[in-house]
Amino acid sequence: AWELTILHTNDVHSRLEQTSEDSSKCVNASRCMGGVARLFTKVQQIRRAEPNVLLLDAGDQYQGTIWFTVYKGAEVAHFMNALRYDAMALGNHEFDNGVEGLIEPLLKEAKFPILSANIKAKGPLASQISGLYLPYKVLPVGDEVVGIVGYTSKETPFLSNPGTNLVFEDEITALQPEVDKLKTLNVNKIIALGHSGFEMDKLIAQKVRGVDVVVGGHSNTFLYTGNPPSKEVPAGKYPFIVTSDDGRKVPVVQAYAFGKYLGYLKIEFDERGNVISSHGNPILLNSSIPEDPSIKADINKWRIKLDNYSTQELGKTIVYLDGSSQSCRFRECNMGNLICDAMINNNLRHTDEMFWNHVSMCILNGGGIRSPIDERNNGTITWENLAAVLPFGGTFDLVQLKGSTLKKAFEHSVHRYGQSTGEFLQVGGIHVVYDLSRKPGDRVVKLDVLCTKCRVPSYDPLKMDEVYKVILPNFLANGGDGFQMIKDELLRHDSGDQDINVVSTYISKMKVIYPAVEGRIKFSTGSH
């Protein structure tokens, strides 16, 4: 028998520095977790103790903090090189700055293979990107070889900016011939490493003949065997065992997100490359693991540029940006409008001639808007200003919801109106009218939404049975502020870009902004 140790990360999302337990900015260092310096300590400890170790990443290193905003992926290549990753799969967020924003900072700088079998380049891009990412790679590990085959969510064109010259094929269809090719090369130990979410990971384990292990990402799935060490609730045991269609037991793993855990899986293979046993658990990277001093010193060196960036002007406002709780928790506020407009603008994807865009709606809990911005400071808006407005380090995500769920959400928005509670919704691409004289749960008297399948966008009444795409904060997607109906009833959830980054990009693009209060939210019968 031959034993392989797979160390894995996924959805790190720019958390190069240690973070608080909830993966936001580290405040009390003695309670902080993750970060590449701490990750390196643990990886090195395992490399020294065990003979056959692979360090893999399942995508979405890009996007999530000011590190990515400033360094645009150069930081990913630099620190992944320093940690000596063996391979990475492309995630959807690796395309956030377009194909060039992937090629230049990452593909050309990585000292490790970057993989995806289901992304096919066409047209002029085909020759330009040839060899920079691969469908699979065979790696020597000790005296054996291991094949690693990559995959990426086929929803990427709706979630990011891969352009028109990359085709995202069905994962299973694309993976099978590559695995078959590895078999003909006498590679009998094959890991599928990819970024399509836990449901697809399980399908790959079930359907793709010859895949021995699946290491996934995208869904931020936390798996654990035994008592979990932090706040995350396991979605299943680690590894999650899938019985393949040809009768094999295939371990499937994922390691939550944000570099909080290091996935640790030990696999025992027989001489024919069959998995005999698999066991392990994600390792919580808490403060009991010291940060590696040389990586930490490097992080501190790279940090200097971030501090300079946060005080530079992004753009100007010529109006007061009202982000006060007195406004945003009670009525339409222009800060809410600005943020929602930025959220929609960030999700412009012309992927179908029938649609002017794939999504037109935004909702945003008023309680998530934490500060106004005064225009009397020469109109200057900085990253620092925006960090006061959106201090929680969240993301603006894409969900699919039924009209009936949206109706419930808007009822919840005003179910206890008047108490300055955070669930009051700010909107974009939605016109809502409330009648507060009616009983809670029956206060939405009009709810019109902006069409997407139209050449001239206009507002139509919400249809209860129709499925709509909506952009919203991850906080709401996860049921925050009492929006349990969103969490329970959402049909799809894809995590998006860092909230501050979305707004800062929009302001930089617009240069001068002047958001108004324009009747998106109204109150009827003189009740307000």
Partner: antibody, heavy 117, light 107 residues
């Protein structure tokens, strides 16, 4: 397949400058960095520097900063190494090599530079 | 700069023999080590990258190993065409630096 075409030899007078060329084929020129390496007769190899053809960004060995200048012409898909104020110490074979995963994977045949009056 | 020291500087070996060259870095180079073969009057040919990964088309009798500061290249069964000079290169840190080379000759 990947090939890097370099002229066989150049003879230049001391004090002059020379521009050595490297024309790759078999891959997209701007998609990979290009290394330059010096080898004096009967000696080992010395790394001069590297250039990113898509944006002209360079990294140099400090020992060659005042001697060598790396450039590219994307219209002809050619990389160049310019050497100035030549002395007999600069007589050597100069190789270009494509960078992949950080290291040089494919090498040119080398240009033999002779500095002689 | 990182100094790369190769040993021995030259060696004789018989056909079919197992041959090992070593390369020592002045500091940890994180396995970012290359091995090249150079024949007289020819350009270097890359054999191994990342300390132990064989380039496509390189015969399987070549293998690399090592980590930290110490690395080695092994030819499991020497063939006539293997004679030449073998160089190591670290690409962990700029400037990249080469070892002085090991000259391999057939007995």
């Amino acid at each position: 397949q990947v090939q890097l075409q370099q002229p066989g030899a150049e003879v230049v007078k001391p004090g002059a400058s020379v521009r050595l060329s490297c024309k790759p084929s078999g891959y997209f020129f701007t998609s990979y960095w290009m290394h330059w390496v010096k080898q004096r007769p009967g000696q080992g190899l010395e790394w001069i520097g590297e250039i990113n053809p898509s944006n002209g960004r360079t990294n140099y060995n400090e020992n060659f900063k005042s001697k060598a200048t790396l450039t590219v012409d994307t219209s002809s898909s050619t990389a160049y190494l310019q050497l100035s104020s030549l002395t007999s110490e600069d007589s050597a074979v100069y190789y270009c090599a494509r960078r992949n995963y950080g290291y040089p994977d494919y090498w040119g045949q080398g240009t033999t530079l002779t500095v002689s009056s | 700069d990182i100094k790369m020291t190769q040993s021995p500087s030259s060696m004789y070996a018989s056909l079919g023999e197992r041959v090992t060259f070593t390369c020592k870095a002045s500091q940890d180079i994180n396995t970012y080590l290359n091995w090249f073969q150079q024949k007289p009057g020819k350009s270097p040919k890359t054999l191994i990258y990342r300390a132990n990964r064989l380039l496509d088309g390189v015969p399987s009798r070549f293998s690399g190993s090592g980590s930290g500061q110490d690395y080695s290249l092994t030819i499991s069964s020497l063939e006539y065409e293997d004679m030449g000079i073998y160089y190591c290169l670290q690409y962990d840190e700029i400037p990249y630096t080469f070892g002085g080379g090991t000259k391999l000759e057939i007995k």
